[in-house]
């Protein structure tokens, strides 16, 4: 049975709409909650597409608009249609088309071809995408001054980038409960707005924020050591597109030092957490002396799955240890700020020599010639194996 | 799998200096210590020293303590060795090592013979 | 240092044969003894570690035993590929120091 509707099924998920002059709107399509494919052809009055006209069509993989009237899209137009991969534009009137329409799209496939898209810093990004045989791009046609059949390159003076961002910071150190500015300066051709994304400052800094293009200054009220490691961000964006720069405010603050009780892993570990800004320099103690280190004994980090703290974990990690190593380890942390220190007692092992004055002593006699194999138990006390 | 490359041979003259390369791949470079061993033509197993590639630090026997410098290069998983002062004596093939998953040398080098001549 | 003492220096044997070498520590060094054998022109091979756990793809032939300072490495029913230079050393903390060598040779 043939389909008088303006709009009619193909398959069981697509919609034609054909019959000429009778769509100004795709807003409201009947059935559209869960179509694929959109096909629409011959719509001298469809001139512009908004974001609401695709709304409630989240499953939407392939849209072409093709021999209509269609001037403008807006650059949220496929807000609602995440899935979109395939996006036919050809044969329309379209001058321009902003990046910000595809960005966030995985497009397989765009064609422009037959629109009298005009040669501008605006349509940088298509040029860059058919150079680079991005998403198979077509567009044929693009007017410089006057109609081409090829896609012609900007004038060599013509100087088409996305903005430049800097963000200014203080040089002296930040410490604990001090405001720090920030100031993002932006450059670049036809600006069209700027801000900071600050999301992950919560808790750590009340924030104001003041100015407007091409200066957006910052203060972070009364920061704290949560603002370590955390991302301060502006972007700013124009005709070509978007450029962001973070920084990360440094807030200085004295070392701590945790210890565990020493937990047989693979090898012998004695857990440790330092934290400090800057990162503090650790050094180890066994029974009051520096402990030096060797591939018997030795400080391991734990590679932390967090680059977004300050606090480092990690183990002394012992190879092997025997009663001589039991004692007491002492961690010292220190920066510029303060130093800390943690003690744990650590046994690993029984030492074999030791007895209780009631046993009976063990006596070896030696053969006269001396070549006993027998050692002398006594342990001495500056002959530690890990030194 | 582990591997520790160095070049076959060196030809140094006497009282020159000489870095000897150790290129690790196949594991976590900074989680092992590196060491060198010396073995002269004909004679045992000589350990040198040590070193944490994690942090540089080093330990060397004391006869070596004056003719070895350790180092290391982690952007490349490298470890070098420097040999300073050559004489005939330095003449050896120098290997690096790493330990497996206990304190024992599973994984050596192919070693790099020195030659110390005039 | 702790020093190891090796013996024999050299040993002749055929195939089939089982021997013994020895190595002696000049302190107690535990468990923490590890053989390893040379071919000439080759690096050294990992056997044994803390004494008689053998290595991955050693075969069972070889086994070690000993604690304390007396420590020996008994190879049975000897294979061709088995002749070569045999080291003991002891891994108990640093410096780390071998034996002199044993060499067995195809009598």
């Known amino acids: 049975a043939s389909c008088r509707e303006v709009c009619c099924p193909v398959g069981p998920s697509g919609l034609r709409c054909t019959r000429a002059g009778s769509l100004d709107t795709l807003r409201g399509l009947r059935g559209a909650g869960n179509l694929t494919e959109l096909y629409v052809e011959n719509q001298q009055h469809l001139q512009r597409l908004e974001f609401e006209d695709l709304q409630g069509l989240g499953e939407l993989r392939s849209l072409t608009i093709v021999k209509s009237g269609l001037r403008f899209v807006a650059p949220d137009a496929f807000r609602f249609t995440p899935r979109l991969s395939h996006l036919n534009l050809s044969s329309n009137a379209l001058e321009s088309l902003s990046w910000k329409t595809v960005q966030g799209l995985s497009l397989q496939d765009l064609t422009l071809s037959g629109n009298p898209l005009h040669c501008s810093c605006a349509l940088f990004w298509l040029q860059r995408w058919e150079q680079e045989g991005l998403c198979g791009v077509h567009t044929q046609t693009l007017h410089d001054s006057g109609p081409g059949d090829q896609f012609l390159p900007l004038g060599h003076n013509t100087s088409c980038g996305v903005p430049t961002v800097k963000i200014q910071m203080p040089n002296d150190s930040v410490e604990v409960g001090d405001d720090v500015f920030l100031q993002c300066q932006v450059e670049g051709l036809a600006l069209q707005q700027a801000d900071w994304i600050l999301t992950e400052l919560e808790g750590a800094a009340t924030v104001k924020k003041f100015g407007d293009l091409p200066s957006l200054g910052l203060i972070l009220v009364n920061v704290t050591s949560d603002l370590n490691k955390k991302n301060v961000t502006c972007w700013a964006e124009n005709d070509v597109g978007r450029a962001e720069v973070s920084v990360q405010v440094s807030v200085s603050f004295p070392a701590s030092v945790h210890l565990g009780l020493a937990v047989e892993q693979h090898h012998w570990c004695i857990p440790f957490s330092v934290d400090g800004q800057p990162a503090p320099s650790l050094r180890w103690l066994f029974n009051g002396s520096v402990l030096n280190e060797t591939s018997f004994i030795f400080t391991q980090f734990l590679e932390s799955a967090l680059t977004n703290e300050t606090m480092r974990h990690g183990c002394l990690r012992l190879n092997q240890p025997t009663h001589v190593n039991n004692g007491n380890y002492t961690l010292l942390a220190a920066n510029p700020y303060g130093q800390a220190a943690a003690s744990v007692m650590a046994a690993f092992m029984d030492n074999p020599f030791e007895f209780n004055p009631e046993d009976p002593i063990p006596v070896s006699f030696s053969p006269v010639d001396g070549n006993s194999t027998s050692r002398d138990p006594v342990e001495k006390k500056d002959e530690t194996p890990f030194g | 799998q582990v591997q520790l490359q160095q070049p076959g041979a060196e030809l140094v003259k006497p009282g020159a200096s000489v870095q000897l390369s150790c290129k690790a791949s196949?594991?976590?470079?900074?989680?092992?210590?590196i060491h060198w061993v010396k073995q002269r033509p004909g004679q045992g197993l000589e350990w040198i020293g040590e070193?944490?590639?994690?942090?540089?630090?080093?330990n060397y026997i004391e006869k070596f303590k004056n003719k070895a410098t350790l180092t290391i290069d982690k952007s490349s998983n490298t470890a070098y060795m420097q040999l300073s002062g050559l004489t005939p004596e330095d003449s050896a093939v120098y290997y690096c090592?790493?330990?497996?998953?206990?304190?024992?040398?599973?994984?050596w080098g192919q070693g790099t013979l020195v030659t110390v001549s005039a | 240092d702790i020093q190891m003492t090796q013996s024999p220096a050299s040993l002749s044997a055929s195939v089939g044969d089982t021997v013994t070498i020895t190595c002696r520590a000049s302190e107690n060094i535990y468990t923490y003894l590890a053989w390893y054998q040379q071919k000439q022109g080759k690096s050294p091979q990992l056997l044994v570690h803390?004494?008689?756990t053998l290595a991955e793809g050693v075969p069972s032939r070889f086994s070690g035993s000993g604690s304390g300072t007396q420590f020996s490495l008994k190879i049975s029913s000897l294979q061709p590929e088995d002749f070569g230079t045999y080291y003991c050393q002891h891994h108990y903390g640093v410096p780390l120091t071998f034996g002199a060598g044993t060499k067995l040779e195809l009598k």
């Open positions: 090592a790493k330990y497996g998953n206990y304190v024992a040398f599973a994984y």
């Open positions: 070193i944490n590639p994690n942090n540089g630090l080093t």
């Open positions: 196949g594991y976590t470079f900074t989680s092992y210590w």
């Open positions: 803390n004494t008689k």
